[in-house]
C-alpha cells in the first residue's frame, strides 16, 4: 500500500466539490522528505479560515508574535462511485521552532487508527515546514461515507481542519427487503421494500411472478398492499437510482392450506388395554399444526362400527390410546389440523391389544360340604366374556383353614374346563374360607369375595351350602 497511484480528479458540480469518476490529473508520491509541492486540491489563500486556530504563545528572538496556525482550505466535498480510489489531503505550514508535530485523521468524530492509508509528508524551508497529510482509499465502499478532518496538536492546543465530506455513490442498497410469508387465501397482506443511495432519490418498482406490478415507480420506502392471492406467488422489488438498478431477493408467498395426512404411523407398544402410537406429520400446509386426532374403531366385522376419537396436542407426535378391550383388533387412523382445517385421515392401520389378566372374579361362588367323601365342593360361574381379557386357561382357588390356634392357606390350580372343583377337608371343627380367581395367559385376575363354611367334628351333619351372590342378586 506504499506505491504511488494516480487518482482521478474532476471538478465537482458545485464550488469546493470534486467528482472523481473521470480524468486522472495529479498524484502524490507516498514518500517523506522534500518534494515539489504538488497539491491534491488547490489551496485558497486569502480566504478567511473557519476552522480552529491556535495562536502560539512562543515568540521569536525579536519577540514578534507568530501568525496564527491554521490548516489551509481544501476541497470540501468529494463524490465518487463505489470501488473507485480516492486520495485527499490537508496541509499546514508550521514555523520551524515547533518540533514533533503530528497530524491525526478523524472520521465522523472518531480517530482513524491502524491500517489506513495515511501518509504525512514534510517540506522544510528556512522558517516554516509545509506539512501535507494525505489519506487514500484504494476501493471505496459505502462505509467510507462521512466527514473527514485533520487534527494537529501544538503546545496543548488543537488545530482542526475544515471537514472533507466523502460521498460514495453506487447502485441502490437495500435496507429492507420483502420477507417470505404464508398467507390465507384471498386475504390482503403488505410487503415492504426500502433502499438507499447515494445518489438519492431511490425509486421502487414491484415485481410479481416476473411481471411489474406498478406502472409508476414509488419513492423508497415502498409498501405494496396485495389484495389477496389464490395461489403461490414470487415477489421482488427493483430499486432504481441514477447509478442503475438493484433487484431484491425473490420471496415466495405461500397460500395456507389444510395439512397433508401423516406419512408414517408406528405401533410402539401394546398392552391389554392400551396401544402406544407415534406418527410422522405430513406437510403442514404452511401453517403450524395445532392438534391431532386419533380415530379408533374395532376391526371386528361384527362390531357396531362406532369410532372412538382421541384428541391430543400436535407435539410430541405420540399418543397412548387407552380404555381398549383386551385381545381385540383395532383400526387406527391419524389426522392433524392447522388453522385452516383438518388433514385427511391417514390410511387405516391395524393394531391389536394383548391378553390381560381377567378384570373381574368368577361369579356366584358356592361352597358346600360333602361329608360322606370328606370333601368340600366348590361351584362358580365364569367372569363375563368381555371381562375375561383373554382366553381362560384355568382358575386359582385359595382355601384357608382356621381352627383354635391353627391357620393354614392352600392354593389349587384347576383347568379351564367346567366350573366346579373339589378339595379335601384339611381340618375338622374349623372354618374353611374359599376365594377363586380366573387365570389367562395375561395373568391372574382378582379373587372373589371370601365364602366361609364350617367343617364340623366327625359325625356332625350340616349340608347347608355357603355362597357369594351373583351381581344384582344381593
Amino acid at each position: 500500500r506504499e506505491e504511488a497511484k494516480p487518482y482521478p480528479l474532476f471538478p465537482g458540480p458545485f464550488p469546493g466539490s470534486l467528482q472523481t469518476d473521470h480524468t486522472p490529473l495529479l498524484s502524490l508520491p507516498h514518500a517523506s522528505g522534500y518534494q515539489p509541492a504538488l497539491m491534491f486540491s488547490p489551496t485558497q489563500p486569502g480566504r478567511p479560515h473557519t476552522g480552529n486556530v491556535a495562536i502560539p504563545q512562543v515568540t521569536s528572538v525579536e519577540s514578534k508574535p507568530l501568525p496564527p496556525l491554521a490548516f489551509k482550505h481544501t476541497v470540501g466535498h468529494i463524490i465518487l462511485s463505489e470501488h473507485k480510489g480516492v486520495k485527499f489531503n490537508c496541509s499546514i505550514s508550521v514555523p520551524n521552532i515547533y518540533q514533533d508535530t503530528t497530524i491525526s485523521w478523524w472520521k465522523d468524530g472518531k480517530e482513524l487508527l491502524g491500517a489506513h492509508h495515511a501518509i504525512t509528508q514534510f517540506y522544510p524551508d528556512d522558517e516554516v515546514t509545509a506539512i501535507i497529510a494525505s489519506f487514500s482509499i484504494t476501493s471505496v465502499q459505502r462505509s467510507d461515507n462521512g466527514s473527514y478532518i485533520c487534527k494537529m496538536k501544538i503546545n496543548n492546543e488543537e488545530i482542526v481542519s475544515d471537514p472533507i465530506y466523502i460521498e460514495v455513490q453506487g447502485l441502490p442498497h437495500f435496507t429492507k427487503q420483502p420477507e417470505s410469508m404464508n398467507v390465507t387465501r384471498n386475504t390482503a397482506f403488505n410487503l415492504t421494500c426500502q433502499a438507499v443511495g447515494p445518489p438519492e432519490p431511490v425509486n421502487i418498482f414491484w415485481v410479481q411472478n416476473s411481471s411489474r406490478v406498478n406502472e409508476q415507480p414509488e419513492k423508497s420506502p415502498s409498501v405494496l398492499t396485495v389484495p389477496g392471492l389464490t395461489e403461490m406467488a414470487v415477489f421482488s422489488c427493483e430499486a432504481h437510482n441514477d447509478k442503475g438498478l438493484t433487484v431484491s431477493k425473490g420471496v415466495q408467498i405461500n397460500i395456507k392450506a389444510i395439512p397433508s395426512p401423516p406419512t408414517e404411523v408406528s405401533i410402539r407398544n401394546s398392552t391389554a388395554h392400551s396401544i402406544l402410537i407415534s406418527w410422522v406429520p405430513g406437510f403442514d400446509g404452511y401453517s403450524p399444526f395445532r392438534n391431532c386426532s386419533i380415530q379408533v374403531k374395532e376391526a371386528d366385522p361384527l362390531s357396531n362400527g362406532s369410532v372412538m376419537i382421541f384428541n391430543t396436542s400436535a407435539l410430541p407426535h405420540l399418543y397412548q390410546i387407552k380404555q381398549l378391550q383386551a385381545l381385540a383388533n383395532y383400526s387406527i387412523g391419524v389426522s392433524c389440523m392447522n388453522e385452516i382445517g383438518w388433514s385427511a385421515v391417514s390410511p387405516w392401520i391395524l393394531a391389536s391389544t394383548t391378553e390381560g389378566a381377567p378384570s373381574v372374579a368368577p361369579l356366584n361362588v358356592t361352597v358346600f360340604l360333602n361329608e360322606s367323601s370328606d370333601n368340600v365342593d366348590i361351584r362358580w360361574m365364569k367372569p363375563p366374556t368381555k371381562q375375561q381379557d383373554g382366553e381362560l386357561v384355568g382358575y386359582r382357588i385359595s382355601h384357608v383353614w382356621q381352627s383354635a390356634g391353627i391357620s393354614k392357606e392352600l392354593l389349587e390350580e384347576v383347568g379351564q374346563n367346567g366350573s366346579r372343583a373339589r378339595i379335601s377337608v384339611q381340618v375338622h371343627n374349623a372354618t374353611c374360607t374359599v376365594r377363586i380367581a380366573a387365570v389367562t395367559r395375561g395373568g391372574v385376575g382378582p379373587f372373589s369375595d371370601p365364602v366361609k363354611i364350617f367343617i364340623p367334628a366327625h359325625g356332625w351333619v350340616d349340608y347347608a351350602p355357603s355362597s357369594t351372590p351373583a351381581p344384582g342378586n344381593a
Partner: antibody
Framework: EQQLVESGGGLIQPGGSLRLSCAVS????????MSWVRQAPGKGLEWIGI???????YSASWAKGRFTISKDSSKNTMYLQMNSLRAEDTAVYFC??????????????????????WGQGTLVTVSS | DAQMTQSPSTLSASVGDRVTITCQSS????????LSWYQQKPGKPPKLLIY???DLASGVPSRFSGSGSGTEFTLTISSLQPDDFATYYC???????????FGGGTKVEIK
Amino acid sequence: EQQLVESGGGLIQPGGSLRLSCAVSGFSLSSNAMSWVRQAPGKGLEWIGIISSSGSTYSASWAKGRFTISKDSSKNTMYLQMNSLRAEDTAVYFCARVGFFVGYGAYDYGIIHRLDLWGQGTLVTVSS
Amino acid sequence: DAQMTQSPSTLSASVGDRVTITCQSSKSIYNNNWLSWYQQKPGKPPKLLIYDASDLASGVPSRFSGSGSGTEFTLTISSLQPDDFATYYCAGGYSGDSDYAFGGGTKVEIK
C-alpha cells in the same frame, strides 16, 4: 418441485461393490420413508427395501446381507450399498418415496402403503 | 414369501375398449385393501395410478378404476386411450412381513 435423482450406476465386475445415491429435492427425508426397487432388463419390478423417516430399515429376504440402505438427512440423500454383485443384479435401480408407511416397532417389521413418487432410475450392469 | 399373480401377462386391445386386469395374492393383503396399481411406459419409471385398491392417485383420469378386497383385485380401464398402452403392475404388503410384493405385470398393447 418434488424430485428424486438416482446416480452411481455403471459397469461393475462380478463380486464388486457399488453405492447408489438418491438425491431428494422438494421434500425432506426426515418426514418420509423411502424405498429402492429394481427392474432387470425386460423383466418386472422387484422391491429391495425401505428406510423409514427415523432411519429404521427393512429389506426383502433375498437382499438381506448383501444390500444395505442408509441415508444422510443433512444432505437429503438416500443410499443403496450393494456388495458381492452378481450378473443377476444387472437392472435399473429406482428410488421411490413411500406415500405412507406403518411400522411395528415391537415386531421389527413395517408395511408400505404406496410408492407415490419415483426417480428416473440408474442402470447397474454386472459383467466381466 | 407371498406371491402376487397378475393376469393376463399380455393383453391386445383397441382404443375405446374396456380393459380388465386381475391381480391375485397368495394371502390376504394388509388391511384387506393396501393394494396399489402402477403404470410404466418403456424407458420411464413406474407411476402410481391407484392405492387402497380403489382410490385414484392425484392427476389420474377417471377412466381408471380399481376394486377388490383381501386376495382378489381388479384394475379396469373403461375406455382405452392411446396414452394407456403400457405395462401395469399391482403391488401390496402383508401383516407380519415387510415385503412389498409386485405382480409380474400386464402389458397392454395395440391390437
